[in-house]
């Protein structure tokens, strides 16, 4: 039975041209995390594998940095970066856990971080 929950940075906003850290945390399970995939809608951004380390998709190499931890840093943000981001935790023996983050990239300096929330 899957007992874990994923806590994410939730709904967040950031300024155009700035950077943001996408973070997820898996808790309430002893399952081993073998890999974390980061996706934006239907595009692979990056993968962190327990054995192989990080792989950043070539088309995002200039604007995506691995970490901190299993998180992902997006740099040089544009309005087109607004949207849903998913952290997909592959674990053994539990299986797959998915967390969702919504990022809004704003033109002005009114960006604020949203509250943290949990996805079971």
């Amino acid at each position: 039975m899957m007992t874990g929950t994923i806590e994410t940075t939730g709904n967040i906003s950031a300024e155009k041209g700035g950077s943001i850290i996408l973070q997820c945390h898996l808790s309430s399970t002893t399952a081993q995390v073998t890999q974390v995939n980061w996706e934006q809608q239907d595009q692979l951004l990056a993968i962190c594998n327990a054995d192989l380390g990080w792989h950043i998709s070539p088309s995002f190499k200039d604007r995506v940095a691995p970490g901190p931890g299993l998180g992902l840093t997006l740099q040089s943000l544009t309005v087109n970066d607004t949207g849903e981001y998913f952290c997909i935790y592959h674990t053994y023996p539990d299986g797959t856990y998915t967390g969702r983050i919504f990022l809004e990239v704003l033109e002005s300096s009114v960006a604020e971080h949203g509250a943290r929330f949990q996805i079971p």
Epitope: E39, L44, L52
Partner: antibody, heavy 118, light 107 residues
Framework: EVQLLESGGGLVQPGGSLRLSCAAS????????MHWVRQAPGKGLEWVAS????????YYADSVKGRFTISRDNSKNTLYLQMNSLRAEDTAVYYC???????????WGQGTLVTVSS | DIQMTQSPSSLSASVGDRVTITCRAS??????LNWYQQKPGKAPKLLIY???SLQSGVPSRFSGSGSGTDFTLTISSLQPEDFATYYC?????????FGGGTKVEIK
């Protein structure tokens, strides 16, 4: 240089058994998931089986489930496919393949031909 | 199981032509789609992974696009060495499945 070298193919009668091996070199074998993919003469590619890097999980195509067993020996950098109760439709070139991040096949062996015929 | 449907099954083209091959999944596979090239008597070779990422060492005339259920492999200017069979493959879920292949022949 990454190398995958299959062996063990040959002619076998229906109902017989074969064990394929794939010797890996040029990379840290124990860090990668490995797959077997086959191709019948003149046909397309068919995934057969896969095994995680730490041997914790194995997966099989329905067409071979219960007859084929995938395994690996990380200390010997070798992947295996034990094939039992072979059928004529198992006739194919069998490729071993390296799969980083459980996502794409970036290296293939040269293949070994298995012919099941009486 | 996820079915992968490739079209066309074969095509004839000339050197310098722009060639497009499509692959459709029977359900959404996000960007878990890879493209391979195979020449007669040889093992397949990875061209594109994760729908649009060019594998290291593959010429830039190859490109991939799409997400969800519909994907495209494009060869911007066909070269003599590109005449081969091309396969798509989904790695979204087990069993992994391949398209039926597209044979690119010389016109």
């Amino acid at each position: 240089e990454v190398q995958l070298l299959e062996s063990g193919g040959g002619l076998v009668q229906p109902g017989g058994s074969l064990r394929l091996s794939c010797a890996a070199s040029g990379f840290t074998f124990s860090s990668y998931s490995m797959h077997w993919v086959r191709q019948a003469p003149g046909k397309g590619l068919e995934w057969v089986a896969s095994i995680k890097s730490d041997t914790s999980s194995t997966y099989y195509a329905d067409s071979v489930k219960g007859r084929f067993t995938i395994s690996r020996d990380n200390s010997k950098n070798t992947l295996y496919l034990q094939m039992n109760s072979l059928r004529a439709e198992d006739t194919a070139v069998y490729y071993c393949a390296r799969v980083p991040y459980d996502y794409w096949i970036d290296y293939w062996g040269q293949g070994t031909l298995v012919t099941v015929s009486s | 199981d996820i079915q992968m449907t490739q079209s066309p099954s074969s095509l004839s083209a000339s050197v310098g032509d722009r060639v497009t091959i499509t692959c459709r999944a029977s359900q959404s596979i996000s960007s878990y789609l890879n493209w391979y090239q195979q020449k007669p008597g040889k093992a397949p070779k990875l061209l594109i992974y994760a729908a649009s990422s060019l594998q290291s060492g593959v010429p830039s005339r190859f490109s991939g696009s799409g997400s969800g259920t519909d994907f495209t492999l494009t060869i911007s200017s066909l070269q003599p060495e590109d005449f081969a069979t091309y396969y798509c493959q989904q790695s979204y879920s087990t069993p992994l499945t391949f398209g039926g292949g597209t044979k690119v022949e010389i016109k």
